[in-house]
């Protein structure tokens, strides 16, 4: 594991990374839940969508999210890999024309209606973590991850590799 400077050096590359294709390399419809098996749900309220983290009743249907995966090239000077280095980026859409967005000023995760090409705020670097969980790092704010705070999704700053394993930024993807 490496310390604060290591995380920052790695994630600094996200600012300059470029999506290598306008089409996703694959798409996947899945339910999203927390490390502790709470479901991420989406509700239409007053013509806007709210995002909740909650325990579902038995046999209650889980909301699905369309995950679209894109390849993103590391800038060669950052990764030390020349043109070799790639990252896997993802956008998350729970319903047509709406995508999860990182609001870095408010440290919040919001659903925004928008057209393609999507803004950078809709892209997250996918990290495979332990226990077959994943984490989502903001493209626009390296070192900041989607996490759970007070039964809502929020943006959480991670400043050391040890904190990358904290449960509140770990999510599970499931087809069921």
């Amino acid at each position: 594991a490496f310390g604060i400077s290591g995380v920052q050096k790695y994630t600094r590359a996200l600012h300059d990374s470029s999506i290598t294709g306008i089409s996703p390399i694959t798409e996947y419809l899945a339910s999203l839940s927390t490390y502790n098996d709470q479901s991420i749900t989406f509700a239409l309220e007053d013509e806007s969508y709210e995002i909740y983290v909650e325990d579902l009743k038995k046999d209650e249907k889980k909301d699905k999210v369309l995950l679209s995966y894109y390849e993103s090239q590391h800038p060669s000077n950052e990764s030390g890999d020349g043109v070799d280095g790639k990252m896997l980026m993802v956008t998350l859409s729970p319903t047509k024309d709406f995508w999860l967005h990182a609001n870095n000023k408010e440290h919040s995760v919001e659903l925004h209606k928008c057209e393609k090409p999507l803004p950078d705020q809709a892209f997250f670097v996918l990290h495979n973590m332990h226990s077959n969980c994943v984490s989502f790092e903001c493209k626009t704010d390296p070192g900041v991850f989607i996490g759970v705070k007070d039964n809502h999704l929020a943006l959480i700053k991670v400043d050391s590799s040890e904190n990358l394993c904290t449960e509140n930024i770990l999510f599970k993807l499931s087809e069921t």
Epitope: F2, Y10, S79, G85, L126
Partner: antibody, heavy 122, light 107 residues
């Protein structure tokens, strides 16, 4: 150019230990998922262990849990596999490999070393 | 653990033939599948990743398809250098498991 060079293989008695090394060049080791894969001569491939780039989290296949330890030295850009309590069934060529994607194993393994042979026999 | 079943285990073909190798996962793995080529005494070489993405430098006669549980590697017109063993690997979840391999031999 990305290069992975394994070393440390050899003949060891059952119950003995070996430490395999994988020297990486052309990229930053700590930015990528790395894995050890083994192959019994003439047989198929088996994933043994892996380590996450950014978090350092480790993974093991059931047959080596508690006996093998994967680690890395970031300053030397080198990956290790410490193998203890070795058994005859651990005899294989051991490869280290690097993922396509820096933060994810979803893309599989793009770069491989040449392999190092471990023989466990009395 | 996810089991990967590859078929056939071996196939005898001629140069110029079309070759199809299939791989079946014991549970859904979305598109998280890779295909490798291995020649005797050498390390595996990545051909296809994310089920259908062609690795840079790999000839276009290689292609991959499928999602969920059923996947296919196709070599459209076999060349002399393609005689080798081919492996699929699920990259969906740990432990990342390989198929048993398909040996492509000269008829």
């Amino acid at each position: 150019e990305v290069q992975l060079v394994e070393s440390g293989g050899g003949l060891v008695q059952p119950g003995g230990s070996l430490r395999l090394s994988c020297a990486a060049s052309g990229f930053t080791l700590r930015s990528y998922f790395m894995t050890w894969v083994r192959q019994v001569p003439g047989k198929g491939l088996e994933g043994v262990s892996a380590i996450s780039g950014i978090s350092g989290g480790t993974y093991y296949t059931d047959s080596v849990k508690g006996r093998f330890t994967i680690s890395r030295d970031n300053s030397k850009n080198t990956l290790f596999l410490q193998m203890n309590s070795l058994r005859a069934e651990d005899t294989a060529v051991y490869f280290c490999a690097r993922t396509v994607y820096s933060s994810s194993y979803y893309g599989g393994f793009q770069h491989w070393g040449q392999g190092t042979l471990v023989t466990v026999s009395s | 653990d996810i089991q990967m079943t590859q078929s056939p285990s071996s196939v005898s073909v001629s140069v110029g033939d079309r070759v199809t190798i299939t791989c079946r996962a014991s549970q859904g793995i979305s598109s998280w599948l890779a295909w490798y080529q291995q020649k005797p005494g050498k390390a595996p070489k990545l051909l296809i990743y994310v089920a259908s993405s062609l690795q840079s430098g790999v000839p276009s006669r290689f292609s991959g398809s499928g999602s969920g549980t059923d996947f296919t590697l196709t070599i459209s017109s076999l060349q002399p250098e393609d005689f080798a063993t081919y492996y699929c690997q699920q990259t969906n979840s740990f432990p990342l498991t390989f198929g048993g391999g398909t040996k492509v031999e000269i008829k």
